[in-house]
């Protein structure tokens, strides 16, 4: 019961996390900027992984997509890649985990197969969460190191001057959504991995005493079959006994003090 709950909760948490990663990737507010030196109107600029937007206090808003792939900063490309990998892994993980859920019966799927699938999806969720956290962190680091209060001046060779606009670059909402979503996916993945341990059937050795009818060569031996999981080495389903007692493969059974009860 606890295993099913852990697995189900892990699935739900991961589902919410992956939805958050998708939302963060699509959001425009990765970086927000106030353009200080504009004497006309308050200009608010915000940028995502796919497009940049300008919003003015007058209500005017315009967004423009980054239509080129080659000219963009390498960091932006890296963040895009990390987020997409996170989404793809998460989506595959969700698909696998649906079939792995203990509460869903699919044909004659054994618990061992479900355990394997649960572990696989858990690992995928963990990697997906890490990708999202890494992507968001790389972007945040890019903002902090490269852009915080840029005010440097420079001059062009054409004689016209160019200077960087004094802007305050702040973390956009998407960064926080991404961090939380990545964390949730990670936690969900860990929960799935924990649930996997409970799902995996244990190999139980049943100890049995051999009962022999006197003067007969066939031994009656109750119980003693190893639980067949497909993982163990007991391929012939031989009975397992204490103290080196003989198996039924042996031709002859000799009387012992245990034969007469």
């Amino acid at each position: 019961m606890a295993v099913t709950a852990c697995q189900g909760l892990g699935f739900v948490v991961s589902l919410i996390g992956i939805a958050g990663i998708i939302a963060a990737t699509c959001m425009d507010q990765w970086s927000t900027q106030d353009l200080y030196n504009n004497p006309v109107t308050a200009v608010f600029n915000y940028q995502g992984l796919w497009r940049s937007c300008v919003r003015e206090s007058s209500g005017f808003t315009e967004c423009r997509g980054y239509f080129t792939l080659l000219g963009l900063p390498a960091m932006l490309q890296a963040v895009r890649a990390l987020m997409i990998v996170g989404i793809v892994l998460g989506a595959i993980g969700l698909l696998v985990s649906i079939f792995a859920l203990k509460c869903i019966r699919i044909g004659s799927m054994e618990d061992s197969a479900k355990a394997n699938m649960t572990l696989t999806s858990g690992i995928m969720f963990i990697v997906s969460g890490l990708c999202a956290i890494a992507g968001v962190s790389v972007f945040a680091n890019m903002l902090v190191t490269n852009f915080w209060m840029s005010t440097a001046n420079m001059y062009t060779g054409m004689g016209g001057m160019v200077q960087t606009v004094q802007t305050r670059y702040t973390f956009g909402a998407a960064l926080f959504v991404g961090w939380v979503a990545g964390g949730l996916t990670l936690i969900g993945g860990v929960m799935m991995c924990i649930a996997c341990r409970g799902l995996a059937p244990e190999e139980t050795n049943y100890k049995a005493v051999s009962y022999h009818a006197s003067g007969h060569s066939v031994a009656y031996k109750p119980g003693g079959f190893k639980a067949s999981t497909g993982f163990g080495s007991n391929t012939k389903n031989k009975k397992i006994y204490d103290g080196g007692a003989r198996t039924e493969d042996e031709v002859q059974s000799y009387p012992s003090k245990h034969d007469y009860v």
Epitope: L35, N37, S52, V54, E62, P73, T156
Partner: nanobody, 122 residues
């Protein structure tokens, strides 16, 4: 990489009109505010008029009612229609644009043109 080219300056009589234009070219991603500044001999550079991408305009008090700023976002061009010109309007007029580049759409730059001379004299 990015060029701002002003045109339309010249000599005009008091009360006359001129239309300045400034075209931005190069690897521009998005232009936000565009404006005109002027610098008279021996004076500081001052704002004449500025217009945002959305069309919100602002003028210095001395030109209000006489000058009109407009822009064409598709052409990355800003215009300054100057009517009822006075001798005190004589200056070098500089075009200015806040923009970001295709190679770095996360950083804003202010580019300036080289200026065009406007002389109001009888």
């Amino acid at each position: 990489q990015v060029q701002l080219v002003e045109s339309g300056g010249g000599l005009v009589q008091p009360g006359g009109s001129l239309r300045l234009s400034c075209a931005a070219s190069g690897s521009i991603f998005l232009i936000n505010a565009m404006g005109w500044y002027r610098q008279a001999p021996g004076k500081q550079r001052e704002l004449v008029a500025v217009i945002t991408r959305g069309g919100s305009a602002n003028y210095t008090d001395s030109v209000k009612g006489r000058f009109t700023i407009s822009r064409d976002n598709a052409k990355n061009t800003v215009y300054l229609q100057m009517n009822s010109l006075k001798p005190e309007d004589t200056a070098v007029y500089y075009c200015n644009a806040d923009l970001n580049l295709r190679s770095d759409p996360f950083k804003w730059y202010t580019f300036w043109g080289q200026g065009t001379q406007v002389t109001v004299s009888s």
